[in-house]
């Protein structure tokens, strides 16, 4: 199906700056740190290869990665079809993120990885400190009052919350492009619907309290005869592509070896269940703690915050993708109309959730349109 | 220190069945789950079946309808009621227990009871 895997893409075993500067792009790294004590590298590629000379402010454009994911997805293609490099390149200052857990995001001023505290967050913490924190340090660093917010997957999900809680931050924002949107996951087909079947007493026994490990628990959705072949062998047991599904169809193969040397970059076992939460409630809603006792402490009410998506006035433009296992069109179907300020919308018939960051074709289908949306945002 | 202990296990005929137990000694008076989980020469290690302290029960899909787990709190027990059994049943059967406390989980395994199903 997808021929051998070669193991020969250098990008393997670098980090983040490594895999730009292989390229022969300008990359700076900084370290972020949040108001509870999360240490978060920060990428920049100031400007593209060919541009160095152009003088003046260039506009910002911060790439914000999924569940289960990092920095690297923004550049783990050929430039000619990476958003990152694609951006640099057409003139823009380029800023990669990393949520807290994920393999370039695991230090703490105050807790080891190795403790449980550490891991005691989910995607609210990453909408309340690492999206702030983040945008505070760019737009402080660049002296640019506003930047562009690219979102993907779980990136648009800390978007929708951070900038519809947080005013002043959704201010800095001048358009948010929401690659795979997810708010709610009532309608999602993805394998992350199976860990709803898991009670929440159960929850930690089966996948511990720190770093999400799912081992071979998926195995038993999984149809033996479609893993058993070389290469699906290796996506079947990722937990990123296990839980977000993949497609042959659109992938560069011989740049697989990147995505699974990268992938999945780790999140907490609370984040997972957070997820698997919305998965039963059906809603977008805060982290719940388990008992109104809890929620009293945390929210001060016994049901845990819902979250008003049309709260958030920010300028956005929306792709999804009609194959799409985790960010299900008829989930999308339900935020469209409760963005008050949707300014583009286009569902790719054929993508699938991974398709938005990977796809040979994104470019033409996807980051094209970015770009030009950009520029337009210029005049 | 806490030590698991199993029994039950042996070599059955395709369809039979069995009934696994595992007892915790020692000093824990905490414990939240129970469980059941198994490897089969040559692969990883899986999950078979769940229990909290409350009775809510989990399954994998490989032994739902065949295989029943319970406890016994007084007597810090989990059993493995396994019915209709299959020949890729045959495994070391391991129990584990744990204590959720407010600084993290503490484990505990049993060493393991061989099942072995013939067909």
């Known amino acids: 199906l997808f021929g051998k895997l070669h193991p020969g893409s250098p990008e393997v075993t670098m980090n983040i700056s490594q895999m730009i500067t292989y390229w022969g792009y300008p990359n700076e790294e900084y370290e972020v740190v949040t108001e509870d004590g999360y240490i978060l590298e920060v990428n920049r590629i100031p400007y593209g290869k060919k541009n160095s000379g152009n003088t003046g402010q260039r506009p910002v454009v911060f790439l914000q990665h999924g569940l289960l994911a990092s920095a690297t997805n923004w550049i783990s293609n050929l430039p000619n079809n990476s958003l990152a490099f694609i951006l640099a390149d057409a003139g823009y200052d380029v800023w990669l993120g990393n949520s807290r857990g994920n393999t370039w995001a695991r230090r703490n001023l105050y807790y080891s990885p190795d403790s449980v505290e550490f891991w005691a967050f989910s995607f609210d913490e990453m909408a309340k400190y690492d999206l702030p924190a983040t945008i505070d340090f760019i737009v402080k660093k660049t002296g640019q009052k506003q930047l562009h917010y690219v979102g993907h997957s779980q990136g648009t999900t800390i978007g929708f919350i951070a900038f519809s809680t947080n005013p002043s931050l959704a201010k800095r924002i001048k358009t948010f492009y929401a690659l795979a949107p997810v708010a709610t996951v009532k309608y999602t087909k993805s394998l992350i619907n199976k860990l709803r079947f898991v009670p929440q007493s159960l929850f930690k026994f089966i996948f511990g309290d720190k770093i999400f490990y799912p081992h071979n628990f998926f195995d038993q959705f999984l149809a033996t005869e479609v893993c058993s072949r070389e290469m699906l062998n290796l996506l079947c047991s990722n937990a990123l592509f296990i839980i977000c599904g993949f497609d042959s169809k659109n992938f560069n193969t011989s740049r697989l070896d990147v995505y699974l040397s990268h992938n999945p970059a780790g999140t907490s076992v609370q984040n997972m269940f957070h997820w698997t939460q919305a998965v039963k409630s059906g809603k977008f809603q805060a982290y719940d703690w388990g008992s109104p006792v809890q929620n009293r402490m945390h929210y001060d009410q016994s049901q845990p915050p819902y979250y008003n998506v049309t709260a958030m006035n920010v300028p956005i433009a929306v792709w999804n993708g009609g194959k799409d296992l985790l960010a299900d069109p008829q989930d999308v179907g339900l935020l469209l109309p409760k963005l008050p300020n949707l300014i583009y919308h286009k569902e790719i018939p054929f993508y699938n959730h991974l398709d938005f960051i990977w796809a040979m074709d994104a470019p033409q289908e996807v980051y094209n349109d970015i770009v030009s949306m950009i520029s337009e945002d210029k005049k | 220190q806490v030590q698991l202990q199993e029994s039950g296990g042996g070599l059955v005929q395709a369809g039979g069945s069995l009934r696994l137990s595992c007892t915790a000694s020692?000093?824990?008076?905490?414990?939240?789950?129970m469980g059941w989980y198994r490897q089969a020469p040559g692969k990883q290690r899986e999950l078979v079946a769940a229990?909290?302290?409350?009775?809510?029960?989990y399954y994998t899909e490989f032994v739902k309808g065949r295989f029943t787990i319970s406890r016994d709190n007084a007597k810090k027990a989990v059993y493995l009621q396994m019915n209709n059994l299959k020949s890729e049943d045959t495994a070391v059967y391991s129990c584990?227990?744990?204590?959720?406390?407010?600084?993290?989980?503490?484990?505990?395994w049993g060493q393991g009871t061989q099942v072995t199903v013939s067909s």
């Open positions: 584990k227990m744990t204590d959720m406390g407010r600084y993290g989980t503490s484990e505990w």
């Open positions: 020692g000093t824990t008076d905490n414990i939240n789950a």
């Open positions: 229990i909290s302290s409350g009775g809510d029960t």
